[in-house]
């Protein structure tokens, strides 16, 4: 499994999408786990609803939410109020019994907020081809999401 990089801004929301074959994984619950070291175990963060038919319902664990479009075959994880300690390697998983298949390895990169001027030695002014609005695009991707950018992430 190769890795997909998602980059987000500290203090904002990051949406991660893991596409999968909806037929192959029909009836299976999904999970989001954090990889502990390169060869260590993957520690469960959050999983979809216990009833597979209710997988579309968003489930939270702390600041992390999961929801599954079982027909479209897209697992979506939202990391709210992203912090530097959220950076690292994760997995989207498909569960069957006590086993878990890796759908996708995900590397979360956290970057400084361009509008937060508390970082010493980091003077910043918008360049000619970027605006403050551009700097606050929510970092998200899925089959359909890249058509139009979301100018401001939801604060929920």
């Amino acid at each position: 499994h190769n890795t997909t990089v998602f980059q987000g801004v500290a203090g904002q929301s990051l949406q991660v999408s893991c596409p999968y074959d909806s037929m192959k994984h029909w009836g299976r619950r999904k999970a989001w786990c954090r990889q502990l070291g390169e060869k260590g175990p993957c520690q469960r963060v959050v999983s979809t609803h216990n009833l597979w038919l209710l997988s579309f319902l968003r489930r939270w664990n702390g600041s992390t939410a999961i929801t599954d479009d079982t027909l479209g075959g897209t697992l979506t994880i939202t990391l709210r109020n992203l912090q530097p300690h959220d950076a690292g390697l994760y997995q989207c998983q498909s569960l069957h019994g006590s086993e878990a298949d890796t759908l996708r390895k995900v590397l979360v990169e956290v970057l400084a907020d361009p509008l937060d001027h508390r970082d010493a030695g980091d003077l910043w002014f918008p360049g000619e081809s970027e605006s403050f609005e551009d700097a606050h695009v929510e970092h998200s991707i899925s089959r359909s999401l890249l058509e139009g950018e979301i100018p401001f992430p939801p604060t929920s």
């Epitope: 990089v5 590397l107 990169e109 361009p114 970082d119 002014f125 360049g127 700097a135 695009v137």
Partner: antibody, heavy 118, light 107 residues
Amino acid sequence: GVQLQQSGPELVKPGASVKMSCKASGYKFTSYIIHWVNQKPGQGLEWIGYINPYSDGTNYNEKFKGKATLTSDKSSSTAYMELSSLTSEDSAVYYCARSSYRYGFDYWGQGTTLTVSS
Amino acid sequence: DIQMTQSSSSFSVSLGDRVTITCKASEDIYNRLAWYQQKPGNAPRLLISGATSLETGVPSRFNGSGSGKDYTLSITSLQTEDVATYYCQQYWSTPWTFGGGTKLEIK
């Protein structure tokens, strides 16, 4: 405006190491990832890896692990790439580039030409 | 690694022509695709990211389309300044990979 200024051309002997720099200006250095890409004469582009200046996290193309080492210095808004155990195969133009929030590389340095020859 | 294949390494074109450059990924890259233009002696320039989003300052005659494994860069009416080499790049899966390039030459 945004600029990535790379260090000048390098002529080095086989077996030696070289460290090239990429100085960023016109934007907040810790808000964007810096990538390194090489291009051999008359050939295409190849991704070497990136550094996240905010976390100092790196991600390498497996092919360049052990060959390239990426670092950054927040105080001077500069990214560095060190290449070791150089051979003539490493002769190329090396670019640094910033990835935008849509992930494409929106600003590039002018390139550093590395020539490895005895 | 994901292979990016640009079917033509070079194209002979006339000014004013509509030009279509194709790029095929070895697996689905879910629209995580960028197009670059490079002129001799210069660094590449980002034209399109997210398969379809035109970068600021890029003329509207450039258009990106496609999904899944197959992507296209179109130039509606070729201008002199468009003569260059064009590269596609996927950033769905590490290592991020580029196509071999398509060089446009005037007939």
